[in-house]
Interface confidence: medium
């Protein structure tokens, strides 16, 4: 059977295909889609291999009718350089001269002058040319050759390989040489394929079960790097939630040489985006990044300096990190039109269960414009899809000169975007060069502006038109989730209960509340429950939230306000230090880090109890 | 893969006592909380005790100031003394675990095979 990069070579004038008898003959017969000296693919831009020899089609020399024979593949040779010519001819590199039939008397293929039906060839069963099944690099992971990409065939052990193997390997990876002849060069890498033990190359993160690959031994460009994570079913990095950051950044914590993640400015017409459509709502950008300098449209991210993010010249060779599986994002469907009955009031425009309204006239600084459409029972628009968006400037008036306040800032958690109407960040579309969040230029609030109506940041104190949204009146009401084993308004997680405590109050105080409800302030047993709390409160805008933790009764000896043995510490950088006091966990870029603050400090805080009852599926039966 | 194995189980007359042992092992690389469940002919499987890795312990209302869970985090395992039985204890007792085999993997629960202890005169 045919792998999808195999092909017969076929002339239509004829009816037969190419078909590799020896080595040293390469004719033509009846197509026979079984016959492996038919079947034939690219192994780099420019050869072409024989699957049934392992050898590349090629020439003596660039002249007028010689035999096109078979060779041992050499990416280096001239000789073995093929191009698709207009049309379906198959010339050799840089000259006239294509691959043609031969005649009645030259029964093998020659190289030839002429253009006619007789040179004219298409892959067998399509109308396309040969390199309609071009080569696809195979970007190597790990081994010794900078994810330099697999060079087939390549020799091992005096045996040719066209394809990935475990030859010689008792774990059974795949892997392929870099250079034809691994025997002399030793250079390897694994294959991005999926083979026994394939997941050990990724990094699993027990919150959101997202994995990650940090392939920093290769020195790739932006687009190659791209390219190696896609070959995986994944893509670059892309990084929407500060628990995803901290994460990373812990990851990478050893390593020093920047890294390609998939925030890039690419799109002519539009601002950073991530490669794999994620909204880019959370910034980390090093300080002077990103700069305007052209060219400088792909981003890295820089373990050596905190894992911030730095734009570069995509062209330049760094190590890179993929991700798959279940996005960060939190799962939000956004009904489609024809699902919701839209009954909107007067001078509204009713889209997919929603009510708009453009405030054009009446320019307000955002937060009062906010405060106008929630009196007007809704809120500022948030905007979760393309077709959301292209609504608003298709139906709803929008007119190319306008600059109008939408939902979106980071008043809250600097560099961290968000809705004011609370929905989840699902879809972003800055314009070029945006956001341009500077510190020295506090652009907290976004705007639509321009006749495509992307978004720009820009300060909350200018007066702008707006726009606002509000639920149509049809509506069902909402439902509070109770899970099981916890009262209402409580999150489990694993054997226990949490709540966030919304008064601020003392530590002594938050203790005697969390006891009045049957609970406790929270103690932190490890770092998965760690990684919870900090999905809990990390991005919350207030800035500390009390755990059980203290040094009140011994100075200097930490202790939970229950019987419970500290066997895990998450500190803040400084801390303990030598002042005593109560232990809060930090919310916004550090979050989850523990700080130590004076006790009496107003905080909020989160209680925890043991979850009642049942707290897992059924044993299965055997 | 972590296994669970209990022992102690048996026939005790009421009022008696029993000590239930339950020995993690396996590939583990941290154990979170251990526990103890029941589950009587006919009923639902129910929580008895559970511990956590910091020694916080939580009892079912039906045994509490009768049975007293424990245990070793240097050995992986988890112990219910049971005292003052009665014949409403009477099921099959399961071991339970929340533990990661490596670093980067999120916690599972394991669970032992369970051990029959009917109190009876």
């Known amino acids: 059977l045919l792998d999808t990069r195999q092909f017969l070579i076929y002339n239509e004038d004829h009816k037969r295909c190419v078909d590799a008898v020896s080595p040293s003959a390469v004719q033509t017969a009846a197509c026979n889609q079984d016959a492996e000296s038919q079947k034939f693919r690219w192994v780099s831009e420019s050869q072409i291999m024989s699957v049934a020899f392992k050898l590349c089609l090629g020439v003596p020399s660039k002249t007028d009718w010689v035999a096109i024979t078979l060779y041992a593949c050499d990416s280096k040779s001239e000789f073995q350089k093929w191009e698709c010519k207009n049309d379906t001819l198959l010339g050799i590199k840089g000259e006239d001269l294509f691959f043609n039939y031969g005649n009645r008397q030259e029964k093998n293929i020659m190289l030839y002058k002429g253009s006619g039906l007789w040179s004219r060839w298409k892959i067998y069963g399509t109308t396309d040319n040969l390199c309609s099944r071009g080569y696809e690099a195979m970007y190597t992971l790990l081994g010794n050759a900078n994810g330099a990409t697999c060079a087939f065939p390549f020799k091992f052990e005096n045996k040719w390989y066209a394809d990935c193997t475990s030859a010689g390997r008792s774990d059974g990876w795949l892997w392929c040489g870099t250079t034809t002849d691994y025997d002399t060069d030793k250079l390897f890498g694994y294959c991005p394929l999926k083979f026994e033990g394939s997941e050990s190359l990724w990094n699993k993160d027990p919150l959101t079960s997202v994995s990650y690959q940090i392939n920093s031994k290769s020195a790739l460009t932006w687009h190659q790097a791209r390219k190696s994570c896609q070959q995986q079913n994944a893509e670059l990095l892309s990084i929407t939630e500060i628990h995803e950051q901290t994460y990373l950044t812990g990851l990478t914590s050893s390593l020093t040489s920047g890294l390609w993640i998939g925030l890039n400015s690419l799109s002519f017409n539009s601002g950073w985006q991530w490669s794999d459509r994620s909204p880019f709502r959370y910034l980390n950008w090093l300080p002077g990044s990103p700069s305007a300098e052209p060219g400088k449209s792909c981003v890295s991210l820089n373990p050596g300096k905190n894992a911030k993010w730095e734009n570069l010249e995509c062209v330049q060779k760094l190590g890179y990190i993929c991700k798959k599986g279940n996005t960060t994002l939190n799962s939000f469907v956004i009904p489609s039109e024809s699902d919701v009955p839209t009954h909107c009031p007067s001078q509204w425009w009713p889209y997919a269960g929603h009510c708009y309204k453009i405030h054009r006239d009446e320019k307000k600084i955002q937060r009062d414009a906010l405060t106008t459409c929630r009196k007007e029972g809704g809120d500022l628009t948030s905007i979760h899809t393309i077709e959301e968006l292209d609504f608003i400037i298709s139906q709803l008036g929008y007119e190319p000169n306008d600059e109008l306040w939408i939902g979106l800032n980071d008043i809250k958690i600097q560099m961290y975007f968000e809705w004011s109407d609370g929905t989840p960040v699902t879809f972003t579309k800055w314009l070029r060069g945006e956001p341009s969040h500077e510190n020295n230029r506090q652009e907290d609030c976004v705007v639509m502006k321009g006749k495509d109506g992307y978004w720009a940041d820009r300060g909350c104190e200018w007066p702008l038109g707006y726009i606002c949204k509000m639920k149509s009146r049809s509506q069902g009401p909402e439902i509070v989730e109770v899970e099981k084993g916890c009262r209402k308004g409580w999150k489990k997680h694993h054997f226990y209960c949490y709540m966030i405590g919304h008064t601020l109050s003392t530590f002594a105080e938050a203790n005697q509340t969390c006891n009045n409800e049957n609970a406790y302030l929270t103690t932190i047993e490890d770092r998965y429950e760690q990684a919870f709390l900090t999905s809990f409160v990390g991005l919350r805008p207030e800035k500390y939230f009390w755990t059980g933790l203290s040094d009140i009764q011994t100075k200097g000896t930490f202790q939970w306000t229950i019987e419970e043995e500290v066997r895990f510490t998450h500190w803040n950088s400084d801390m303990p230090g030598r002042k005593p006091g109560c232990v809060a966990m930090r919310t916004g870029i550090a979050g989850g880090l523990w700080d130590v603050l004076k006790c009496d400090e107003k905080a909020k805080f989160v209680c925890k109890h043991w979850a009642e009852g049942v707290t897992h599926p059924p044993k299965p039966t055997t | 893969q972590v296994q669970l194995q209990e022992s102690g189980g048996g026939l005790v007359q009421p009022g008696g006592s029993l000590k239930l042992s339950c020995a993690a092992s396996g590939s583990i690389f941290s154990i979170k909380t251990m526990g103890w469940y029941r589950q009587a002919p006919g009923k639902q499987r129910e929580l008895v005790a559970a511990?956590?890795?910091?020694?916080?312990?939580n009892y079912a209302d039906s045994v509490k100031g009768r049975f007293t869970i424990s245990r070793d985090n240097a050995k992986n395992a988890v112990y219910l003394q049971m005292n003052s039985l009665k014949p409403e204890d009477t099921a099959v007792y399961y071991c339970?675990?929340?533990?990661?085999?490596?670093?980067?993997?999120?916690?599972?629960?394991?669970w032992g095979q369970g051990t029959q202890v009917t109190v009876s005169s």
């Open positions: 339970n675990a929340d533990g990661v085999v490596a670093w980067d993997q999120p916690y599972d629960n394991y």
């Open positions: 511990v956590s890795s910091g020694g916080s312990t």
